[in-house]
Every structure is written in C-alpha cells, then in structure tokens.
C-alpha cells in the first residue's frame, strides 16, 4: 500500500494505491483511492506512467479527457466513472501488454487540494494448474499442466505424507512456447506416486504463485487449485 500526500501550494489530500500485477492479454486494474469530493465536476484524475510523455488517462469535469493520452494506451483505458464521486480513481487497463509494466502515478486534484501516489505494476502471465493422473504412463504418474506463464516459473512438487521430500529426481518439467511467442505452457510430470496421498504441484515466478493439489485414494480423486499474486503492496 502506498499513501501519498499533496505538497505545497494548496491543501493536500490523501491518495492510496496498491501495487498489483497484470496478466498479459487480459484486463487489469490499477487501484487508486482518494478523499472524495462533493462535486464530480471538481475532481480531476490523471494517471501517468514513468518514462511516458503523454498521459495514461485523464478524467475531468465528470468525463474522460483523452486529448493528451499517450499512443501506447489509446483505446485501452477507463476509469469507473460512477465510482469517482466516492473516491475511486482506479484505472481499468484493457489487453495488458508486457510493456505496461512499470511505475504509475495516480494524480488527484479536487476542491480540497491535490495529492498523488505511485504504484508498481508488474506484468506477466499466470494460470491455474491442473493435476491429473496420467493413465498412459507405465507407472503411477501425475501430470501437472498450466497453460500460460511468463516469465518462466519454477515448478516444485510436494507431498503430504513425505513432507520435506525432494521430488526433483522423480519429476520432469518442460516449458513449451505458446503461439504468441511470449507465454509458455508448463507441463510437469511426477513419477512413482503412491496411493492415499496428497500431492501438490507448485508453480511460481516473481508475479504469481499457483498450486494444484490432487488427492488419490482407491475410491476417488480430489483436486483443488489456487493462485496467489505476489507483492501486492499498498502505497
């Protein structure tokens, strides 16, 4: 969390941002909140990106003002116009690109004053893994697949029964470049698995950490997976 304050000249207002990550090819949110104003027409929101000449987005007098918008953001940005009056200046970024990563500034001007806060935005690709029993293999084998990751992640297997065991000798992980030549499909195979055990396939890069669990018993197979974005800090 980053909390910024306005300085000199007129009164300062508190602006708060949260560091976040965007999944390339999908839509992302750059979070920013501020002390609300009574009149929408008195609120100006300006989003900037470090190193970029034009504005990322501007909202003033109750509507978007995109005359100074930078080429790289054209047609890809929107604020939540109906939520501005309650202090939400978050920006929706469509079709997140790898090059959208960087430091952003949420700059707010209201009748109470002005303020700004920076936000670190990481971009990459992350997806939920799915773990299945590989019935085609000669021995009991698990196959963990996740369709889109970038940068290249690490894959670690763990087991509930053999906690702390190192499975690197009995697993094999491959990365296959997807058609857009950026993201990769992750496939990891774990050999010699035993029944009545829960195995976890953990995929992690500097943006996200995802885990796929599978519990194999004689009567059933239970799966569970979850994904967590890393380093989401407020400012």
């Amino acid at each position: 969390l980053i909390i910024g304050f306005g300085i000199s000249g007129r009164h300062s207002i508190t602006v708060t941002t949260v560091a976040s990550a965007g999944n390339i090819g999908e839509d992302g949110i750059l979070s920013c909140t501020f002390e609300p104003d009574i009149k929408l027409s008195d609120i100006v929101i300006q989003w900037l990106k470090e190193g970029v000449l034009g504005l990322v987005h501007e909202f003033k007098e109750g509507k978007d003002e995109l005359s100074e918008q930078d080429e790289m953001f054209r047609g890809r940005t929107a604020v939540f116009a109906d939520q501005v009056i309650v202090g939400n200046a978050s920006l929706r970024l469509k079709n997140v690109q790898l090059t959208d990563a960087g430091t952003y500034k949420c700059y707010i001007i209201t009748s109470k004053g002005k303020g700004n806060a920076n936000l670190e935005y990481k971009t990459g690709a992350f997806s939920m893994p799915e773990v299945n029993v590989d019935y085609n293999a000669s021995s009991e084998t698990l196959r963990c697949e996740a369709p889109r990751w970038f940068p290249q992640p690490t894959v670690v297997w763990a087991s509930q029964v053999d906690q702390g065991a190192n499975f690197s000798e009995v697993s094999n992980t491959s990365f296959e470049l997807n058609s857009e030549n950026v993201t990769m499909k992750v496939v990891s195979v774990l050999y010699n698995v035993t029944i009545n055990n829960t195995y976890s396939c953990m995929i992690e890069n500097d943006i996200a950490k995802a885990t796929g669990d599978i519990k194999v018993t004689e009567s059933e197979i239970k799966r569970r997976s979850h994904l967590q974005l890393l380093n989401s800090k407020a400012s």
Epitope: G9, E50, V52, L53, M72, T99, G102
Partner: antibody, heavy 118, light 107 residues
Framework: EVQLLESGGGLVQPGGSLRLSCAAS????????MHWVRQAPGKGLEWVSG????????YYADSVKGRFTISRDNSKNTLYLQMNSLRAEDTAVYYC???????????WGQGTLVNVSS | DIQMTQSPSSLSASVGDRVTITCRAS??????LAWYQQKPGKAPKLLIY???TLQSGVPSRFSGSGSGTDFTLTISSLQPEDFATYYC?????????FGQGTKVEIK
C-alpha cells in the same frame, strides 16, 4: 546506475550534417521517452526534440523541424539525432535526457559540443 | 507554442537567505512544470516536477508551488552549493519549452 553518454559532436561547416548518439545504460531503455536539449554558449536551455519509448511518436522544436531527425534503436539502447543543413545558430552543447514524468527530464548526459563554423 | 517567462533573470543573495524565483506560462499548463538547477560546465539536474513534487534526493529546502500559469521555486535557506542557474520548463505539450533562466549569485 542510470547513465547517458553522448557522442558525435565536433566541428562542421554550415550546410553540413552530423549524427549525434546517446548510449543509455542502467534502465529499460525501451520503456522511456528520450529527448535532446541544447545550450548555445553562454545561453539558456532549448528543448530540441523528443521521442516516445517505442519510437512511434516524435516531436520537434520549430527551429529544427525538417532539418533534424530523432530516432532510437532499442536493441542497442541508443538514441540518435541526425542533423542536416546545419547553421551557425545550431552551435551548442547537445544533451540527451530521459523522460521521468511526462516531459520532466532526469537524468541528463554530460553533453557533446557541436560547432557549426566555416 | 507555450512561452515560459522567468523572473528575475538574475539575483544576488547571501547564504541563509530565502530565495524566490517565479515562472509564468503563456497559457494554462495545469501543474505540469519542472524546475532544474545547472552549475557552470555541468548538465542540468531535475529538482521539482509536477509544480511541487520534489525529485528523489533533492534537499527539502527546495519547494515549488503554483498552478495554471504562475509558478514559484523557493529555496528556504540558501546554501553555498545552491549558487547556480535555475530553469523552469513546461512539460505538458510539445515543444516542451524552457524559461530563459535565473542566475543566483553570491551577494
């Protein structure tokens, strides 16, 4: 550490051409707009030209429009200024600088002197 | 093009003095103004951007204020290393014009 190093300056006759280079290091060059700013001997700063991170947008001062061309090679982390039809009034120290927020400039290179004289 | 006019063009002051430099834009530039310091034979250094935001590493005795067309750079207590030339620059629209500079000299 962010560094910008200009080169290519020197003595050139009026009507001649020169190409300045600015080698960048210590940051993701393609993410930053870049600029050329000049300073004639004993005078103030004059913004000359700017270019977006991708190279897709270029900007010029009226005094150099049609004569100077700004470009960049992101694979080489290098900014260029091609200067044609040079005039005596183009004599100056030329600085390259990185866009910080909007067109505020930080850091700057150490500068390279261009002397247009017969 | 937006014209930037600085005043005074030069001033003499003593260590410890409070110094104020003004910059006027020929049209509304909102808060998009930067201030630079330049010492003889050196490249300029960014002090303030967005009219009032101090660049990282710049001493807090420097401050900026203003919006629209009128802006001020203030040095609250002048130090020996502050004797230099100061420039304003509008950063909202190409061409990104500079003021003509203010030279701060030792009295």
């Amino acid at each position: 550490e962010v560094q910008l190093l200009e080169s290519g300056g020197g003595l050139v006759q009026p009507g001649g051409s020169l190409r300045l280079s600015c080698a960048a290091s210590g940051f993701t060059f393609s993410s930053y707009g870049m600029h050329w700013v000049r300073q004639a001997p004993g005078k103030g700063l004059e913004w000359v030209s700017g270019i977006s991170g991708s190279g897709g947008s270029t900007y010029y001062a009226d005094s150099v429009k049609g004569r100077f061309t700004i470009s960049r090679d992101n694979s080489k982390n290098t900014l260029y200024l091609q200067m044609n039809s040079l005039r005596a009034e183009d004599t100056a120290v030329y600085y390259c600088a990185r866009t910080q927020w909007r067109a505020s400039l930080d850091p700057w290179g150490q500068g390279t002197l261009v002397n247009v004289s017969s | 093009d937006i014209q930037m006019t600085q005043s005074p063009s030069s001033l003499s002051a003593s260590v410890g003095d409070r110094v104020t430099i003004t910059c006027r834009a020929s049209q509304d530039i909102s808060y998009w103004l930067a201030w630079y310091q330049q010492k003889p034979g050196k490249a300029p250094k960014l002090l303030i951007y967005g009219a009032s935001t101090l660049q990282s590493g710049v001493p807090s005795r420097f401050s900026g204020s203003g919006s629209g067309t009128d802006f001020t750079l203030t040095i609250s207590s002048l130090q020996p290393e502050d004797f230099a030339t100061y420039y304003c620059q509008q950063t909202t629209m190409s061409p990104y014009t500079f003021g003509q500079g203010t030279k701060v000299e030792i009295k």
